[in-house]
Amino acid sequence: QTSVFPPEVILPRGGSVKVNCSASCDQPISLGMETPLPKKEILPGGNNWKMYELSNVQEDSQPMCYSNCPDGQSSAKTLLTVYWTPERVELAPLPPWQPVGKNLTLRCQVEGGAPRANLTVMLLRGEKELSRQSAVGEPAEVTTTVPVGRDDHGANFSCRTELDLRPYVLKLFENTSAPHQLQTFDLPATPPQLVSPQVLEVDTQGTVVCSLDGLFPVSEAQVSLALGDQKLNPTITYGNNSLSAKASVKVTAEEEGTQQLLCGVMLGNQTQETRQTVTIYSFPAPNVNLTKPEVSEGTEVIVECEAHPRAKVMLNGVPAQPPGPRAQFLLKATPEDNGRSFSCSATLEVAGQLVHKNQTRELRVLYGPRLDEKDCPGNWTWPENSQQTPMCQAWGNPLPQLKCLKDGTFPLPIGQSVTVTRDLEGTYLCQARSTRGEVTREVTVNVLSPRYE
């Protein structure tokens, strides 16, 4: 009987092994080994045994020892199992962005590696095992499907092979693919909320706000705001899962008419859009014309208000008759009209909205100077030594200057508290003067002596 030792060997690919062949009789007629592998006899052997070194073992093999003894011929095989770790362990690329709530298929390819029976393929999230499967086929392909949540954003996924030859080989052989980082996103199905004026006046500034809730990761979201061909430059404020983009928009006469306001929120490979119509209009303030802004009292003044051809005007609260863009009225200027405001209010309908513009003009009426008995009494009688305040008010526009002099030299302190003395007695000539002329009025002060009381 022929014996072989060791009967089984597990060795790395390209490795060497020593195999002992022995016969059961003391003096075999022949003793040898049959193998396609390169072999070398290790001398000296024994009477009934030989030692061979097999080298560069590339694949599983079954070298055979044989012996020819007087009692007959026999053979025995040793089982050489070659092991090697895979040459390629690769996780298929992940999608650039993975929507939250949608299943992700992880695919791993394994090229090479033996023995396959001892080769396991694992799919990992970080260091957590998601799936463990045997390597089947060449290349072996392992897949698994996992649900994706927000917490998977930024997670690393990889594929690992384990060649487990224990207890024959004490070591566990691991090969890990390059990790792939997953980018997840959550873009709600609801479109962004767009707050903007429905109508916008040429050369004025409007504010547009576009906001969306339920975004993840919000910092990766991009916002595009445009009014017609005009790209807006928004300031973006981020919340926990929301964003708000605020932009100022100024429109020119060239953009007059209906324009589309577009807000797009891009996240991952998806976009949510909202469109809104904005009507851009031109509406100059109405013109209030006075035949002359400064007139003398008694002059006839035409007050005219003219606005946009499609507007309706009101002049001092009175609508134009018939309703339209023009209104006027005639007045004879009186001192009471000095400083009077003429206000024209124009209303224009733009896209179903009423817009208003006002313009005010003030009329200056030149009159006077005047010195009336009511405001400048001609006679005062005051007790001697009493405290009195001489009052004399001159009226006019421009406001007149006033002086009251007795004998061209003694002034009467108008509006001042005076102690009445004999010196105060007499007739004063009060003069009110403005650029329009001069008026005079005599004012007599009588002083009552205590002895007459």
């Epitope: 061209g408 030299t409 302190p413």
Partner: antibody
């Protein structure tokens, strides 16, 4: 509108001297006219005034020694028994409150009176 | 009597400095006060009327204030051309007067 003094010069103590102020461009029936003097190197001294009505008002020290009178275009200042202390430049002045701030500066150029024996 | 007292009699000031001249009336003259500037050999020239109103052509560095019996003339940012004698005059009463003018203040500019 202008005022100008005349009649100044050398006068002997105890004599009589009349200075005349001639006005143009305004009426003396509407304005008061005053006399002010200034001794060499000294301050301004108010003598008196004649009102638009013709009434006269004098500084307490000038009463009895000076007399102001007027015609339709002139105002006279009569100095009775002048002494060397009356040596001064005499100014004729239209009353400051004649006309709302535009006539306050209506002073004559002054006439010098020298009292010396 | 409506008489005027003016202080100081003389003041020296550097170019760019400030001068304050005071004038006191013996009785209430309200705001009927004038300020004059007089240069050697010339007639007086009006600066201020009604206590604080600037006569036409007078630079704004001249400022008058006060009413009743206390009045002030302030010259800020004094210039060499401001060297002169300054007088106040009450213009309220022409009777019962010793002197309607203050004694004058000589301003010497260094």
């Amino acid at each position: 509108q202008s005022v100008e003094e005349s009649g100044g010069g050398l006068v002997k103590p105890g004599g009589t001297l009349t200075l005349t102020c001639t006005v143009s461009g305004f009426s003396l029936s509407s304005y008061a006219m005053g006399w002010v003097r200034q001794a060499p190197g000294k301050g301004l001294e108010y003598i008196g005034i004649i009102g638009s009505s013709g009434s006269t008002y004098y500084a307490s020290w000038a009463k009895g020694r000076f007399t102001i009178s007027k015609t339709s275009t002139t105002v006279d200042l009569k100095i009775t028994s002048p002494t060397t202390e009356d040596t001064a430049t005499y100014f004729c002045v239209r009353d400051p409150y004649d006309s709302f701030g535009d006539g306050y500066r209506l002073w004559g150029p002054g006439t010098l009176v020298t009292v010396s024996s | 009597a409506y008489d005027m007292t003016q202080t100081p009699a003389s003041v020296e000031v550097a170019v760019g400095g400030t001068v304050t001249i005071k004038c006191q009336a013996s009785e209430n003259i309200y705001r009927y006060l004038l300020w004059y500037q007089q240069k050697l050999g010339q007639r007086p020239s009006l600066l201020i009327y009604d206590a604080s109103k600037l006569a036409s052509g007078v630079p704004s560095r001249f400022k008058g204030s006060g009413s009743g019996t206390e009045f002030t003339l302030t010259i800020s940012g004094v210039q060499s051309d401001d060297a002169a004698t300054y007088y106040c005059q009450q213009a309220y009463s022409s009777s019962n007067v010793d002197n309607a003018f203050g004694g004058g203040t000589e301003v010497v500019v260094k």
